[in-house]
Interface confidence: low
Amino acid sequence: IVLRPSRVHNSEENTMRALTLKDILNGTFSYKTFFPNWISGQEYLHQSADNNIVLYNIETGQSYTILSNRTMKSVNASNYGLSPDRQFVYLESDYSKLWRYSYTATYYIYDLSNGEFVRGNELPRPIQYLCWSPVGSKLAYVYQNNIYLKQRPGDPPFQITFNGRENKIFNGIPDWVYEEEMLATKYALWWSPNGKFLAYAEFNDTDIPVIAYSYYGDEQYPRTINIPYPKAGAKNPVVRIFIIDTTYPAYVGPQEVPVPAMIASSDYYFSWLTWVTDERVCLQWLKRVQNVSVLSICDFREDWQTWDCPKTQEHIEESRTGWAGGFFVSTPVFSYDAISYYKIFSDKDGYKHIHYIKDTVENAIQITSGKWEAINIFRVTQDSLFYSSNEFEEYPGRRNIYRISIGSYPPSKKCVTCHLRKERCQYYTASFSDYAKYYALVCYGPGIPISTLHDGRTDQEIKILEENKELENALKNIQLPKEEIKKLEVDEITLWYKMILPPQFDRSKKYPLLIQVYGGPCSQSVRSVFAVNWISYLASKEGMVIALVDGRGTAFQGDKLLYAVYRKLGVYEVEDQITAVRKFIEMGFIDEKRIAIWGWSYGGYVSSLALASGTGLFKCGIAVAPVSSWEYYASVYTERFMGLPTKDDNLEHYKNSTVMARAEYFRNVDYLLIHGTADDNVHFQNSAQIAKALVNAQVDFQAMWYSDQNHGLSGLSTNHLYTHMTHFLKQCFSLSD
């Protein structure tokens, strides 16, 4: 249980105040984290509060400014990147967001040796992606969907690809669906470790159906946004991987990497690329029916100047109970022998664990085991493997960092973080310098976040990088809600929940309950993290109890729970929220006439289905940007969990699991439906169809659209959204304004 002290003793009661909605919208209680920008084993860069770029040397304790705020300001730079040879810095300005990860920007190159911007052969604008080589100061960049290479920043560019075309052919950058659902990056090019080769993906979207929506702007006529967007069952992008020798790029040109035969026999995806050495690369492929993944290790053949991927170096990962991997198929972390690797996948008991693969997956040596899951491998050195898991104290919503000594036999395991600040910190991530000489730990809670620097050999804390003192002081006179994380055992299913309770919570009283739900496959809402957000305000000021429940389909508790929703989205996720609500009512402090549910995106889908479940449990609810039918959502995501919307596959459940099919059931609840009209991800179409079905069923409901807003509803729309939802809930719960 995490009880946030509300510090309400009689003597202090007068000076304490509840959170306000304004606090939340202004970000008054936001926290800072510190991730060093590592540039060597013992050095990192950091942008100071006054915008100087400062280099820190941990071992000498010295720091100096490598780039002044004056230089940054001269081009209005918002980001920077130091070349590995430390001779140049790129400065990024005119940031223009595209999708979740992608953006375009203008780039200037600053020469640190003479203190001037590089003139001549300047970069074109706007650039879609730019990066330094891992060694020296070569530049690769993507402009108008084509890839260019510069040997030095002042040199003329060498054009690598020529077929790039807007919305048709993408080189070195992903198309919409690969960016959002497969790579989760803005780039699709990868330098080899010493910068000899550059690998890149080409995505051909020529045959993909296009989603078109209006962008209203300020003009007389709205613009139409067109995005090649494959919905479930539609034609997918065609992907090819090429590698070019950057030392002699014109010599043989880009060489295509062959696709494994068992993958190429039907529709497939490329899922990731990992360089092992300058002349060995590892590619991961996935069948369109995403239960078979192939990891292929390819070697450069000097004599033929080609890449060879022998069948003996193909490793197959297959799931018989669900899809391959968790949210994504995990990526390998290679060991120093440059052929064996560590990888997270399900063990025989159905828990995701680290395995060591030396020759075949069948002969994999299991490194971690237990009824918990390894979540991320951070770093493998010659004697240690650092990873995160939720093993400690058996709370799935925690993250601790562990070190396994792989240099000794049998390997010994130690938890690096479990005892550092055990009340304050139970959810960590880490960032390692070269060779794991040093690392930063970033603790996200449940207490106020703190970032610390550690010695990679002894794990000793060297210094605090950021402890959020100002936030701590600001919260001293705030009545924060109490939070507890517990579990319900129901029909052999463990439902973990987080309950956020009003500061003066009294078990003998009755409180309105708001369920906040996401519930998407491989997600996790019940986490031991710090947050002062909208629901904190609802508990602190408005006296609501808020609960988050991780039901079937959620992550890090084993495959039985995760894969329970396979091919059946919209069933068990909803059932488990309802089950939890019934259990909360049994606890005796919930006013069963005042229960609401809300969610965003997948959570909007679940909240809509819960409201339309016909249980009579919910008085009202809100769906923000919900999916309403899986036929409307992206192929890569949807088919992973649902299969194809075809008669001989899973069309029946696609049809049965829509929100529209349950329109009649909304008659006895108050429903608020919200969506942005320029949502590139969950298209406005989803809410338009819900609204149409409700109108056709003559069911009253409330709705709000946000013009020209995407899936995030950012900026002023955020303030409007939360104010609007607050009014709706207060009205539903009969709370005075």
């Epitope: 104290e393 130690k414 938890c415």
Partner: antibody
Framework: DVQLVESGGGLVQPGGSLRLSCAAS????????MTWVRQAPGEGLEWVSG???????YYAESVKGRFTVSRDNSKNTLYLQMNSLRAEDTAIYYC???????????WGLGTLVTVSS | EIVLTQSPGTLSLSPGERATLSCRAS??????LAWYQQKPGQAPRLLIF???NRATGIPDRFSGSGSGTEFTLTISSLEPEDFAVYYC??????????FGGGTKVEIK
């Protein structure tokens, strides 16, 4: 307040059996690893056995195959079933709450087991 | 298994004096070490975990240091209630958890 109270100790003949209990209050035992540690008269501390939150059990080589650790979550009680007892098992047996799987943050007062003919 | 060696076996000091207790591990254990205090007829009590972190309610005259194989427990100024036996325990490599043989701090 966390409290641990051991019981079940006493005099037993070599080869005999005893069952020790450790009743916990102030926390839910099911969420934590628990440990048995013993201390022979005038000697130091020796780890005997442990049980994880998940139910996984561990034993010192000296007691493996003779001792069994278990718990009843509904009673919030930890047990140590000791069979084939030997004179060298004579000790005060402490039950301790384990932080994670690491050190022992709360201890009971102990119960004395004497193995003698 | 990892062997912990504590020294000295007995430390005779007067109230107000500084006590320095040593614990040596047979192989490196990073900072995975705890210290306990045990008074006659009582159960052990956790003092220090992770080599240098004081447990809840432990006065700040107790401090721990060290990492790898050499560890020290320091009591900056002995109070009458500090005369007891002190044990170190490793949790780097387990099972088994191992304890040191103990150091008795007695009144001179």
């Amino acid at each position: 307040d966390v409290q641990l109270v051991e019981s079940g100790g006493g005099l037993v003949q070599p080869g005999g059996s005893l069952r020790l209990s450790c009743a916990a209050s102030g926390f839910s035992m099911s969420n934590f690893a628990m440990t048995w540690v013993r201390q022979a008269p005038g000697e130091g501390l020796e780890w005997v056995s442990g049980i994880r939150g998940s139910g996984t059990t561990y034993y010192a080589e000296s007691v493996k195959g003779r001792f069994t650790v278990s718990r009843d979550n509904s009673k919030n009680t930890l047990y140590l079933q000791m069979n084939s007892l030997r004179a060298e098992d004579t000790a005060i047996y402490y039950c301790a709450k384990t932080w994670g799987t690491e050190y022992f943050d709360y201890w009971g007062l102990g119960t004395l087991v004497t193995v003698s003919s | 298994e990892i062997v912990l060696t504590q020294s000295p076996g007995t430390l005779s000091l007067s109230p107000g004096e500084r006590a320095t207790l040593s614990c040596r591990a047979s192989q490196p254990i990073s900072s995975y070490l705890a210290w306990y205090q045990q008074k006659p007829g009582q159960a052990p009590r956790l003092l220090i975990f992770s080599a240098s972190n004081r447990a809840t309610g432990i006065p700040d005259r107790f401090s721990g240091s060290g990492s790898g194989t050499e560890f020290t427990l320091t009591i900056s100024s002995l109070e009458p209630e500090d005369f007891a036996v002190y044990y170190c325990q490793q949790y780097y490599d387990w099972p088994p958890y191992t304890f040191g043989g103990g150091t008795k701090v007695e009144i001179k």
